[in-house]
Amino acid sequence: SGPLPKPSLQALPSSLVPLEKPVTLRCQGPPGVDLYRLEKLSSSRYQDQAVLFIPAMKRSLAGRYRCSYQNGSLWSLPSDQLELVATGVFAKPSLSAQPGPAVSSGGDVTLQCQTRYGFDQFALYKEGDPAPYKNPERWYRASFPIITVTAAHSGTYRCYSFSSRDPYLWSAPSDPLELVVT
């Protein structure tokens, strides 16, 4: 028999955590697990419990986490890595829509995230979506073209900026931009 199936690792309420705000990491394996091991990668830091509660997010807690579990003498495969991001480390970028935030169905729009700092990475979030669109750019701005807009593209967007040198320390979110599809 091979290794046990991997557990899931999630951050609640989100893996994007404003500085000083709480977050809980939870490792979930099958019922009746003997032992969990949760670790922060590249840190030599571990615990034997399934739940890690962080009462106040700090810069040094940002990074990659994973977990596994043991039943008898067998260890599971490791969970997928969880990227825990500290937000609010830097000032917020600005988010704009070109040619504008109201667009006709079937038309094109470009969301542009811009920062005063020399960041080379940008992330665009749509409220309700689980994952961001990431776009590495060099010149302090990133463009996110949306071609052939549909009603599904309407909603609230925010962007973040950060540096590839510190990929888990992000800016505060931009002010929200409401994209309206008519």
Partner: nanobody
Framework: QVQLQESGGGLVQPGGSLRLSCAAS????????MGWFHQAPGKEREFLAG????????YYADSVRGRFTISRDNAKNTVSLQMNSLNPEDTAVYYC????????????????????WGRGTQVTVSS
């Protein structure tokens, strides 16, 4: 810094038990991750067990998991290591250490993360 003093070491027969205690003084104790290490003659100092500032999170080296139990009492500024099923390979000097700077509760197995150390207590397992 935290000042630390271990006690409870001694001579014990194989299969026996021993409880080590570490008394701490200093205002940062309740914010510190605490760890126990041991050092056998001619060997490196090794991590054995650690406990978070709240006591909710623990971590054990594979060699002692299931035999040793770490606990702490923040009201009394003490951390303890209950050692059961001792064998001759456990013979070493046992050290208590504090990691006061880490803001989380994950326990480091790395010596360099602990900046306060006791002087150690000798544990000898022999018949």
């Amino acid at each position: 810094q935290v000042q630390l003093q271990e006690s409870g070491g001694g001579l014990v027969q194989p299969g026996g038990s021993l409880r080590l205690s570490c008394a701490a003084s200093g205002r940062t104790f309740t914010r510190s991750i605490m760890g126990w290490f041991h050092q056998a003659p001619g060997k490196e100092r090794e991590f054995l067990a650690g406990i978070s500032w709240s006591g909710a999170n623990t971590y054990y080296a594979d060699s002692v998991r299931g035999r040793f139990t770490i606990s702490r009492d923040n009201a009394k500024n003490t951390v303890s290591l209950q050692m059961n099923s001792l064998n001759p390979e456990d013979t070493a000097v046992y050290y208590c250490a504090a990691d006061p700077s880490h803001p989380g509760s994950l326990i480091s197995t790395r010596r360099s993360d602990y900046d306060s150390w006791g002087r150690g207590t000798q544990v000898t397992v022999s018949s």
